[in-house]
Interface confidence: low
């Protein structure tokens, strides 16, 4: 979390942003928050990104105005315009790219003052991993596959029963590279799995956390994943 | 197969407002952007604007703001126009055409729709 | 705004023979992207206009490998060689790396 503040004391607003990671293709939110005005066309939100020689984003008189914009975020960004008037200055930012990383400024002017607050975003691609018994085998396996991720993440396998024990030596990972050569696909093995156990494939690289579990019994088979982002916090 | 579809012409009197349509068919409405182009009589092609199907998002060459407002109805898949305060300088071919955000060149056009203003 | 400037006006040119239009750009037109959105359309008359190539020098499905097209920073080129009836009309260069997007004037390619 990142409070920031105007810079005349009586004539400062709080301004708070979260560090947050966009993932690839899809949209994104910088999230940002000040104290309230009571009249929309008093409240003046900038977004901007250092290095960016153009706005990232303006908002001012109860629309956008987007003359002063970047090329890069050309068409990509929106405020949540009914929010705005309750102090959500977050912005909304369309069909992330590997480029978008680096650190915002979200800058807010309204008749209390001014503040403004910075926030680092990263970029990066992220999946759920989803693990199957991989029937197709010679031997008890078991397959994990997450189709979407960037930076290359790590990939570790972990088991309830044998908890602490290192699987690296029975299991395979591989890294496929999507048709958009930036993202990559993620399959991993886990060979010679014992039954009434459950089993979790972990994959993380710098900007998520991601779990598949599967608990293998003679008569059912039990899935379960989530996802969490790291990093995730405000200024 | 993926068409875009105008009509052919509107006649309209100085100072009033047409609200021109595209339709759109082939293909998912919402992930594509469509744009404007001008064609005046003899003349070259002028770029408008464009919005976004899926949440309406538009975004306008200044020279055209004021003059044109693009709207577009998801559930007939079209895409509008309107022009204001006509003037004989809005005489021209009105085209529409789609553009992938990320490709970005734009792959299908409409046929145009003739705009004449006159009293 | 990205003014695009081609030349010549008009090219009269022979059946079979070869030709080349020039389009300039007033800046140089590539994106913070990296991309350079440079592409030629074909306008033939009464028709509304056909993409040729895109992004400098890709070719559209299904247009003849007789059109490319070269260049970088702000000069770029479109070639047709063995130059045939149906290629006749005015090509426009157009650039969509900076707003507002902007279309070059228009080479009418004409028989000699």
């Known amino acids: 979390l990142i409070i920031g503040f105007g810079i005349s004391g009586r004539h400062s607003i709080t301004v708070t942003t979260v560090a947050s990671a966009g993932n690839i293709g899809e949209d994104g939110i910088l999230s940002c928050t000040f104290e309230p005005d009571i009249k929309l066309s008093d409240i003046v939100i900038q977004w901007l990104k250092e290095g960016v020689l153009g706005l990232v984003h303006e908002f001012k008189e109860g629309k956008d105005e987007l003359s002063e914009q970047d090329e890069m975020f050309r068409g990509r960004t929106a405020v949540f315009a009914d929010q705005v008037i309750v102090g959500n200055a977050s912005l909304r930012l369309k069909n992330v790219q590997l480029t978008d990383a680096g650190t915002y400024k979200c800058y807010i002017i309204t008749s209390k003052g001014k503040g403004n607050a910075n926030l680092e975003y990263k970029t990066g691609a992220f999946s759920m991993p989803e693990v199957n018994v991989d029937y197709n085998a010679s031997s008890e396996t078991l397959r994990c596959e997450a189709p979407r991720w960037f930076p290359q993440p790590t990939v570790v396998w972990a088991s309830q029963v044998d908890q602490g024990a290192n699987f690296s030596e029975v299991s395979n990972t591989s890294f496929e590279l999507n048709s958009e050569n930036v993202t990559m696909k993620v399959v991993s093995v886990l060979y010679n799995v014992t039954i009434n156990n459950t089993y979790s494939c972990m994959i993380e690289n710098d900007i998520a956390k991601a779990t598949g579990d599967i608990k293998v019994t003679e008569s059912e088979i039990k899935r379960r994943s989530h996802l969490q982002l790291l990093n995730s916090k405000a200024s | 197969q993926v068409q875009l579809q105008q009509p052919g012409a509107e006649l309209v009197k100085p100072g009033a407002s047409v609200k021109l349509s595209c339709k759109a068919s082939?293909?998912?409405?919402?992930?594509?952007?469509m744009h404007w182009v001008k064609q005046r009589p003899g003349q070259g092609l002028e770029w408008i604007g464009e919005i976004d199907p899926s949440d309406s998002y538009t975004y306008y060459n200044q020279k055209f703001k004021g003059k044109a407002t693009l709207t577009v109805d998801k559930s007939s898949s079209t895409a509008y126009m309107q022009l204001s305060s006509l003037t004989s300088e809005d005489s021209a071919v009105y085209y529409c055409?789609?553009?992938?955000?990320?490709?970005?060149?734009?792959?299908?056009w409409g046929a145009g729709t003739t705009v004449t203003v006159s009293s | 705004d990205v003014l695009m400037t081609q030349t010549p006006l008009s090219l009269p040119v022979s059946l079979g023979g070869q030709a080349s239009i020039s389009c300039r750009s007033s800046?140089?037109?590539?994106?913070?992207?990296?991309?350079?959105?440079l592409e030629w359309y074909l306008q033939k008359p009464g028709q509304s206009p056909k993409l040729l190539i895109y992004k400098v020098s890709n070719r559209f499905s299904g247009v003849p490998d007789r059109f490319s097209g070269s260049g970088s920073g702000t000069d770029f080129t479109l070639k047709i060689s063995r130059v045939e009836a149906e290629d006749l009309g005015v090509y426009y260069c157009?650039?969509?790396?900076?707003?507002?997007?902007?279309f070059g004037g228009g080479t009418k390619l004409e028989i000699k």
């Open positions: 082939g293909y998912t409405f919402i992930s594509y952007w």
């Open positions: 055409a789609r553009r992938k955000t990320w490709d970005w060149y734009f792959d299908v």
């Open positions: 157009f650039q969509g790396s900076h707003v507002p997007w902007t």
């Open positions: 800046q140089i037109i590539v994106h913070s992207n990296g991309n350079t959105y």
